[in-house]
């Protein structure tokens, strides 16, 4: 029983070290709170899961709304 518990803890530790898993590995949702007040011109690029570079998260949110899409952020910085 104790061995099984240690094994499970070890497995969980390994999973947490290996980073995001499952659906999260596809990307994260853009934070859209700024978009409600209009996007700024600040250049803080993100790479979308569509392979396009967006100048900032707000612009990605804007396009998701206008195009009724669900593009996620696969990484910070340009694609």
């Amino acid at each position: 029983m104790k061995v099984t518990g240690i094994f499970l803890l070890s497995a969980l530790a390994l999973l947490s070290l290996s980073g995001n898993t499952g659906a999260d590995s596809l990307g994260r949702e853009a934070k859209c709170y700024n978009e409600l007040n209009g996007c700024t011109k600040i250049y803080d690029p993100v790479c979308g899961t569509d392979g396009n570079t967006y100048p900032n998260e707000c612009v990605l949110c804007f396009e998701n709304r206008k195009r009724q899409t669900s593009i996620l952020i696969q990484k910070s910085g340009p694609c």
Partner: antibody
């Protein structure tokens, strides 16, 4: 900040229309550009947009025969519309779609396109 | 399909009077609604955005209100220069849309 359409002119039915919108005072790499038209005696009609990402959207009626492209280096956006008919006779406008206000501003002066045999 | 319906199609108003134009969206568009003034031979002019925010340089005699599906543009103290066609436009989405603009309202000033 301003936008201006290239000269329109007289076209024949089935011809392909190519119009260019030249922008100044802002960058295409961080702005949305839209095309809108107005037929004689009719209202404003949205044609399509090209987004910051390069993605495009078109009105459902325009989708099958319209293409919007851009050249960020030349600060130009091009509208190509195929299979023209007399119903495409209109003044064509390009406009910046302002992401901060969610509105078309500024607009170009417009250019008249006439389709007639 | 986010259709925009404007009423009336045409309205006559005396100088100094008040005119009210209504715009109805077929689906909820929040406050993503703009108003434009368009005169023959000119480029359209942005009057109002986000339903009630006055665009730069626009007279405070123009007032926008509403949210969701029902919107109104009111022009008070109408002047001859206000004779034009006014359009509403939804900015919520372009997906599956025929036209983002309403059909327009012609304002005739007596």
């Amino acid at each position: 900040q301003s936008v201006k359409e290239s000269e329109g002119g007289l076209f024949k039915p089935t011809d392909t229309l190519t119009l260019t919108c030249t922008v100044s005072g802002f960058s295409l790499s961080s702005n949305v550009i839209s095309w809108v038209r107005q037929a004689p005696g009719k209202g404003l009609e949205w044609i399509g947009d090209i987004y910051v990402s390069g993605n495009t959207d078109y009105a459902s009626w325009a989708k099958s025969r319209s293409t919007i492209t851009r050249n960020a280096n030349l600060n130009t956006v091009t509208l190509k519309m195929t299979s023209l008919t007399a119903a495409d006779t209109a003044t064509y406008f390009c406009a910046r779609y302002d992401m901060s206000s969610d509105a078309f501003d500024p607009w170009g002066p417009g250019t008249l396109v006439t389709v007639s045999s | 399909a986010y259709d925009m319906t404007q009423t009336p199609a045409s309205v006559e108003v005396a100088v100094g009077g008040t005119v009210t134009i209504k715009c109805q969206a077929s689906q909820n568009i929040g406050s993503y609604l703009s108003w434009y003034q368009h005169k023959p031979g000119q480029r359209p002019r942005l009057l109002m955005y986000r339903a009630s925010t006055l665009a730069s340089g626009v007279s405070s005699r123009f007032k926008g209100s509403g949210s969701g599906t029902e919107f109104t543009l009111t022009i008070s103290g109408v002047q001859c220069d206000n004779a034009a066609t006014y359009y509403c436009q939804q900015g919520y989405t372009n997906s599956g849309v025929d036209n983002t603009f309403g059909g327009g309202t012609e304002v005739v000033v007596k």
